[in-house]
């Protein structure tokens, strides 16, 4: 299996009551605007065929996509939460900038691409869904990277 390096986040990143609460509030606010409840972006399908040791690297890819393709374009929405949560997630992304896996990551890229394709196919409602799943993104980063 590919070896992952520098794919770690300190537990303290997920134990800050204020920003954690704001992240979950943002997710809730967006999920209220999400009518497509049958589709889930972060779940079993995303992790299918990905070993536990590779999951942080996978979540780094999902985090970067979410920031660049969803949160930045939607940054004027869901205030005041968005203006606080985006810098927090950007810091996590920066801390994972040296997270790589040695060897073939095609299976990971394939799973991430499916998530990206789903978001793109749904258009703006896909972006809203991704914001509504920030609580799942938070939990998945926490479980995969600490």
């Amino acid at each position: 299996a590919p070896i992952s390096s520098h794919c770690r986040l300190d537990k303290s990143n997920f134990q800050q009551p204020y920003i954690t609460n704001r992240t979950f509030m943002l997710a809730k606010e967006a999920s209220l605007a999400d009518n497509n409840t049958d589709v889930r972006l972060i779940g079993e399908k995303l992790f299918h065929g990905v070993s536990m040791s590779e999951r942080c690297y996978l979540m780094k890819q999902v985090l970067n996509f979410t920031l660049e393709e969803v949160l930045f374009p939607q940054s004027d929405r869901f205030q005041p939460y968005m203006q606080e949560v985006v810098p927090f997630l950007a810091r996590l992304s920066n801390r994972l900038s040296t997270c790589h896996i040695e060897g073939d990551d095609l299976h990971i890229q394939r799973n991430v691409q499916k998530l990206k394709d789903t978001v793109k196919k749904l258009g703006e409602s896909g972006e809203i869904k991704a914001i509504g799943e920030l609580d799942l993104l938070f939990m998945s980063l926490r479980n995969a990277c600490i």
């Epitope: 809730k28 049958d38 972060i42 079993e44 399908k45 299918h48 609580d135 799942l136 939990m139």
Partner: antibody, heavy 119, light 107 residues
Framework: QVQLVESGAEVKKPGASVKVSCKAS????????ISWVRQAPGQGLEWMGW????????NYAQKFQGRVTMTTDTSTSTAYMELRGLRSDDTAVYYC????????????WGQGTLVTVSS | DIQMTQSPSTLSASIGDRVTITCRAS???YHWLAWYQQKPGKAPKL??????SLASGAPSRFSGSGFGTDFTLTISSLQPDDFATYYC?????????IGGGTKLEIK
């Protein structure tokens, strides 16, 4: 409509095994997981475990590790829960419930299957 | 495993009352908490998910709140149909656990 239909009541001897089925309809079976919860007579609810209908991955409560097996058959949209080495305190109603996945609640429940363990 | 402690275990109330049931987790579970209602001989029914989101089909008199370790289920004005047993369930870790239940009785 969306529903889960469980198999009928069972009476088993101590030491035997039981296999309860849960047939799903009205939704895409592989988009959800199935969790199993049991309830002994006059008691509260007890979580037993979960199976992914997409990957077949399972997660069992520690209490049931080694004694329970949860599976799915996507061709028939059916989930199964097998409990081995039955004891009298396994007498309970066994419920299956639809689980949207990580960290989510159970929005649809089966009607329950009463399993009685008696010599 | 995370332990869920519900209180009270039994609650007597009258029609029209405002009722609150509490649930405490032994460690932080963010908002991964659900509330279910169960009537004798029936399967549980989802009322609240993610601590405060009202489930489809659940009456609006039910509401949930809390984050972290302390959660509440509130019924704003008790109706005859509400006398039942209520359970909280945490999904903050892969092993879900369920509270001991609160039986709501007619005073």
């Amino acid at each position: 409509q969306v529903q889960l239909v469980e198999s009928g009541a069972e009476v088993k001897k101590p030491g035997a095994s039981v296999k309860v089925s849960c047939k799903a309809s009205g939704y895409t079976f592989t988009s959800y997981g199935i969790s199993w919860v049991r309830q002994a007579p006059g008691q509260g609810l007890e979580w037993m475990g979960w199976v992914s209908a997409y990957t077949g991955n399972t997660n069992y409560a520690q209490k049931f590790q080694g004694r329970v097996t949860m599976t799915t058959d996507t061709s028939t949209s059916t989930a199964y829960m097998e409990l081995r080495g039955l004891r009298s305190d396994d007498t309970a109603v066994y419920y299956c419930a639809r689980d949207r996945g990580y960290y989510d609640a159970y929005d649809i429940w089966g009607q329950g299957t009463l399993v009685t363990v008696s010599s | 495993d995370i332990q869920m402690t519900q209180s009270p275990s039994t609650l007597s109330a009258s029609i029209g009352d405002r009722v609150t049931i509490t649930c405490r987790a032994s460690e932080g579970i963010y908002h991964w908490l659900a509330w279910y209602q169960q009537k004798p001989g029936k399967a549980p029914k989802l009322l609240i998910y993610k601590a405060s989101s009202l489930a489809s089909g659940a009456p609006s008199r039910f509401s949930g709140s809390g984050f972290g370790t302390d959660f509440t289920l509130t019924i704003s004005s008790l109706q005859p149909d509400d006398f039942a047993t209520y359970y909280c369930q945490q999904m903050g870790e892969y092993n879900a656990t369920i509270g001991g239940g609160t039986k709501l009785e007619i005073k």
